[in-house]
């Protein structure tokens, strides 16, 4: 499956929007740094089948969408930027869904990748728990924004590697 050229442009736009969501100086938030235990092994494509990688990327973007579409995120972040961000993520999801259908077909079932998808879900559960514990403070959102920017960048790198393998 060939992801459209607009897909990588959308990735870049989403990253730019995340960067623009900064509300306070991050230097004041160093005390709130946290290890969310990003599931790095799910993004190391040593033995990744393409269909598995696409499923993991889809889950990553879906969970990012869920995280930023809560009422707490709307209260903490710029709504105009959030709306633009949702549009970009929605487009990413559509692109990846088309790919999943083509790649998975009848031979493989997405259930084969359940462990990988579960690892991504647990990662986002840790992020949500952190935000809850920190009472959705400005610094907590700043730490999460930085973390999502990093994980999003790693997702983009995986997509680039998949493309170069074609």
């Amino acid at each position: 499956c060939d992801l459209p050229q607009t897909h990588s442009l959308g990735n870049r736009r989403a990253l730019i929007l995340l960067a623009q969501m900064r509300r306070i100086s991050p230097f004041s938030c160093l005390k709130d740094r946290h290890d969310f235990e990003f599931p790095q092994e799910e993004f190391d494509d040593k033995q990744f089948q393409k269909a598995q990688a696409i499923s993991v990327l889809h889950e990553m973007i879906q969970q990012t969408f869920n995280l930023f579409s809560t009422k707490d995120s709307s209260a903490a972040l710029d709504e105009t930027l959030l709306d633009e961000f949702y549009i970009e993520l929605d487009q990413q999801l559509n692109d990846l869904e088309s790919c999943v259908m083509q790649e998975v077909g009848v031979i493989e079932s997405p259930l084969m990748y359940e462990d990988s998808i579960l690892a991504v879900r647990k990662y986002f559960q840790r992020i949500t728990l952190y935000l809850t514990e920190k009472k959705y403070s400005s610094c907590a959102w700043e730490v999460v924004r930085a973390e999502i920017m990093r994980s999003f960048s790693l997702s983009i790198n995986l997509q680039k590697r998949l493309k170069s393998k074609e």
């Epitope: 960067a19 005390k31 740094r33 946290h34 700043e142 930085a146």
Partner: antibody
Amino acid sequence: EVQLVQSGAEVKKPGESLKISCKGSGYSFTSYWIGWVRQMPGKGLEWMGIIDPSDSDTAYSPSFQGQVTISADKSISTAYLQWSSLKASDTAMYYCARHPGLNWAPDFDYWGQGTLVTVSS
Amino acid sequence: DIQMTQSPSSLSASVGDRVTITCRASQSINNLNWYQQKPGKAPKLLIYWASSLQSGVPSRFSGSGSGTDFTLTISSLQPEDFATYYCQQGYDTPFTFGQGTKVEIK
């Protein structure tokens, strides 16, 4: 390969201005902060300040606030440390180092080779 | 500002010795880093987040501690370990370094 390459040694007179540089390569320059550290001859390490190259936000140590200016040009992946009026006491080795920002990762994991600044009349 | 106090300021040891350097923060912190510096060279990160070994650093180096008291241990000193060691708090700005511990050959 991640590298921070600093500009060469400088010999200046008191009262002169100076701008030294630190060029990052082998990684996404805007994804990491750049910190500056001073080491006076035979002395220990002193943290001067830090910059987020993505938007040029800065933080300074109170000891260096107003004495130096930290800046960055993300288009050429370079951070700068500058003085408008040097003093003899600014004679030191200056290091730049990479910091992961708010991410949970090693602090100051890569360092430049250092720039020796000598201020003498 | 958070003050970092290292001890001892210098020590003499032999190859094979177990060496311990301590670092005390003036307030409780959760992010403590250890660096090694050799003459004429840039500092090198050894330990981050108090106890995590930086990639490529020999396992004879270890870090421990929490709150205000931290330790760097070299389990069996090697000839290349003779250098100056610095602790640094990354908990809050302004970041601050300890004054350094020089490890010399006995």
